[in-house]
């Protein structure tokens, strides 16, 4: 047992060292930072034009072919849940410097759990994905 | 409406330390990371530190590493820059600023004014 | 990293348009995307204010005729008709990489 979970886990180690992960990112900052402002902006200020389209509404297209592309690399994670969960956790890590608000991390973390589920793969279970907003001091 | 007010300014000599505070309201000041950004008379900006909503993650500048330390009571709604070794050049007016949650820095404060002279 | 801005001083006549550079010594370009660049608008005595973030998105209440552009290390602020009330000093800063400012571009009407 021992010896098929080492093989185990360098199988999942080897498939994350391959799979390109960035189209998930991409695909999930997209999706929680349609309007950045939502969560800080001043109720007393103007909002912008509604009629002028957003910078995010020109790149809908854009953000569909990430998902397309980020539900293709998870697609290689569907048959153990734990690397799944790797997978899951190394996104985290790599934008966890980016999200520098209570509200914005737990909007990614939301959405991040949700991904295999909008790919049509089973999510895992159990998988921590704490961090605090700003990630490591990576300075 | 977002309020920011720092104070705690005034005029010390080098190698003296102050402490700089920044009352926030209109917000919920334990959700977001904070900054001090300062500017010296005349000339530009200059972004002197940040501190994580939990107050895990610190970061600082080259120029105030090992002299300044930020920190914050999220109980008190409140950001704090405790400066030490003060030097001529950390004369400045000293603002906080609160980051939008994406890394940008949406509200300002009016600043405070730090002297170092002798 | 590293921000330079042109020009450093920018004389422009009323209802002219007006164009600021901001050139960053590495690529602003998260593997997110995004590009961490804004601008921010600092009048005579007053606290700075953010016009754009992430390059190009205009932020809320900041009139249309500013807009931001560029992407890697080059960018530009645009305004398309100079108002009176834009006089003061531009700032570009990036967020890459912890944060930094460029030097300021001063603004004045002829």
């Known amino acids: 047992r021992q010896q098929w979970e080492l093989q185990g886990d360098r199988r999942c180690q080897s498939q994350l060292e391959r799979a390109n992960l960035r189209p998930c990112e991409q695909h999930l900052m997209q999706k929680i930072q349609r309007d950045e402002d939502s969560y800080g902006r001043d109720p007393y200020s103007p909002s912008q034009d509604p009629y002028s389209p957003s910078p995010y509404d020109r790149r809908g297209a854009g953000s569909s072919q990430h998902q397309e592309r980020c539900c293709n690399e998870l697609n290689e994670f569907e048959n153990n849940q734990r690397c799944m969960c790797e997978a899951l956790q190394q996104i985290m890590e790599n934008q966890s410097d980016r999200l520098q608000g209570r509200q914005q991390e737990q909007q990614f973390k939301r959405e991040l759990r949700n991904l295999p589920q909008q790919c049509g793969l089973r999510a895992p279970q159990r998988c921590d994905l704490e961090v605090e907003s700003g990630g490591r001091d990576r300075y | 409406e977002v309020q920011l007010v720092e104070s705690g300014g005034g005029l010390v000599q080098p190698g003296g330390s102050l402490r700089l505070s920044c009352a926030a309201s209109g917000f919920a000041f334990n959700d977001y990371t904070m900054h001090w950004v300062r500017q010296a008379p005349g000339k530009g900006l200059e972004w002197v530190s940040a501190i994580s909503y939990g107050g895990t993650n610190k970061y600082y500048a080259d120029s105030v590493k090992g002299r300044f330390t930020i920190s914050r009571d999220n109980s008190k709604n409140t950001l704090y820059l405790q400066m030490n070794s003060l030097r001529a050049e950390d004369t400045a007016v000293y603002y906080c600023?609160?980051?939008?949650?994406?890394?940008?820095?949406?509200?300002w404060g009016q600043g405070t004014l730090v002297t170092v002279s002798s | 990293i590293v921000l330079t801005q042109s020009p450093l001083s920018l004389p422009v006549t009323l209802g002219q348009p007006a164009s600021i550079s901001c050139r960053s010594s590495?690529?602003?370009?998260?593997?997110?995307?995004?590009?961490?660049l804004d601008w921010f608008h600092q009048r005579p005595g007053q606290s700075p204010r953010r016009l754009i973030y992430m390059a190009s998105k205009r932020a809320s209440g900041v009139p249309d005729r500013f807009s931001g552009s560029g992407s890697g290390t080059d960018f530009t602020l645009k305004i398309s008709r100079v108002d009176a009330e834009d006089v003061g000093v531009y700032y570009c800063?990036?967020?890459?990489?912890?944060?930094?400012f460029g030097q300021g571009t001063k603004l004045t009407v002829l």
């Open positions: 590495q690529s602003l370009v998260h593997r997110n995307g995004y590009n961490y």
């Open positions: 800063m990036q967020a890459l990489q912890t944060w930094t």
């Open positions: 600023a609160k980051d939008s949650g994406y890394r940008s820095l949406l509200h």
